[in-house]
C-alpha cells in the first residue's frame, strides 16, 4: 500500500521540514520561516508556537520541530506542554483568584504552589501532637498519650554505646 | 490566530492617570477570565488584577486597591486598566493575558499573553 501510495500521491515524498506546494505543481518546498512541519507528506506547515510574556523559550523552533516553553522565574508551568503558567506564592500561602493568601489556621503549604491542606490531626492514629503545626508546616506526631504516661517503657531505645573519643556523624 | 494587544503606555507625572486597553482576537473573549500583570526594571512578573467572564468579579493586588480599575468591554472584545494616583513605584511593563480554561475552578494559570506597553511614572 506504502508503494503504491507513493505512486499516486507525490506529496508523501516531501520529508519533515518541508510541505507538498499545490501551487508549485505539488513539490516540496522548505516551511517558510517561524513555521515547522514535524512530520512527511504535510500539505502545509504549522506556524511555530511564540513564547512571550511569561512564558520563556525552552527550545527554539526548527523547520521540524514546534518552539518549546516553559515560564518565567516566579511562576510554573501547568498542562500539557506547559500550556498554561500560574504565578507561585511562598510556602505558607495558596494562590486564589485574589492573588497569594496566607493558610488559614489548620491548614499548611510547604510548597510554592498548590492548595493549603489541613494539618494531620495526630488523634485519628492515637497519637499525640509533638511538634505544632505552622502555616509551612505539617504537625508531627508523636507517640500516644498511653506510652507517655508516668511508668512507661521509653519510646525511644537508648542510643547504643560509642567508643570514647568518637563523635556522632 | 489568537491574539493580545495592549495600548496606552506612556510617560505620566506622579498622581496623573493614564488607561491601558488590551484588543482580544481570535478567541471568545467573553468566556475566559482576563488578568492584568506587571514587571518593574529589574523586577519579577506581578498580578495587578483580573476579572472574571461577566465583570462582575474584580481582584486586586493591595498596593492598587482604589487606585486602579480593571473593567472588559465584550462586545468590543477589549479589557482595559484604569490607573489613577499613580506613583513611580508603578513604573512598569503593562501585560494583559488569559486566564487558562477552568480558571478559577481547577487552577489560576493563564495561556495568552500580549507584548506589554510601557508605563513611566516621573516628573
Known amino acids: 500500500f506504502e508503494r503504491t501510495r507513493s505512486l499516486q500521491d507525490p506529496c508523501s515524498n516531501c520529508p519533515a521540514g518541508t510541505f507538498c506546494d499545490n501551487n508549485r505543481n505539488q513539490i516540496c518546498s522548505p516551511c517558510p520561516p517561524n513555521s515547522f512541519s514535524s512530520a512527511g507528506g504535510q500539505r502545509t506547515c504549522d506556524i511555530c508556537r511564540q513564547c512571550k510574556g511569561v512564558f520563556r523559550t525552552r527550545k527554539e523552533c526548527s523547520s521540524t520541530s514546534n518552539a518549546e516553553c516553559d515560564c518565567t522565574p516566579g511562576f510554573h508551568c501547568l498542562g500539557a506542554g506547559c500550556s498554561m503558567c500560574e504565578q507561585d506564592c511562598k510556602q505558607g500561602q495558596e494562590l486564589t483568584k485574589k492573588g497569594c493568601k496566607d493558610c488559614c489556621f489548620g491548614t499548611f503549604n510547604d510548597q510554592k504552589r498548590g492548595i493549603c491542606r489541613p494539618w494531620t490531626n495526630c488523634s485519628l492514629d492515637g497519637k499525640s501532637v509533638l511538634v505544632n503545626g505552622t502555616k509551612e508546616r505539617d504537625v508531627v506526631c508523636g507517640p500516644s498519650p498511653a506510652d507517655l504516661s508516668p511508668g512507661a517503657s521509653s519510646v525511644t531505645p537508648p542510643a547504643p554505646a560509642r567508643e570514647p573519643g568518637h563523635s556522632p556523624q | 490566530e489568537v491574539q493580545l494587544v495592549e495600548s496606552g503606555g506612556g510617560l505620566v507625572q506622579p498622581g496623573g492617570s493614564l488607561r491601558l486597553s488590551c484588543g482580544a482576537s481570535g478567541f471568545t473573549f467573553s468566556t475566559y477570565w482576563m488578568l492584568w500583570f506587571r514587571q518593574a526594571p529589574g523586577k519579577g512578573l506581578e498580578w495587578v488584577a483580573n476579572?472574571?467572564?461577566?465583570?462582575?468579579?474584580?481582584y486586586y493586588v493591595d498596593s492598587v486597591k482604589g487606585r486602579f480599575t480593571i473593567s472588559r468591554d465584550n462586545a468590543k472584545n477589549s479589557l482595559s486598566l484604569q490607573m489613577n494616583s499613580l506613583r513611580a513605584e508603578d513604573t512598569a511593563t503593562y501585560y494583559c493575558?488569559?486566564?487558562?480554561?477552568?480558571?478559577?475552578?481547577?487552577?489560576?494559570?493563564?495561556?495568552?499573553w500580549g507584548q506589554g506597553t510601557t508605563v513611566t511614572v516621573s516628573s
Open positions: 493575558a488569559r486566564g487558562g480554561d477552568g480558571y478559577s475552578d481547577s487552577h489560576f494559570g493563564t495561556d495568552v
Open positions: 476579572i472574571n467572564q461577566d465583570g462582575s468579579e474584580k
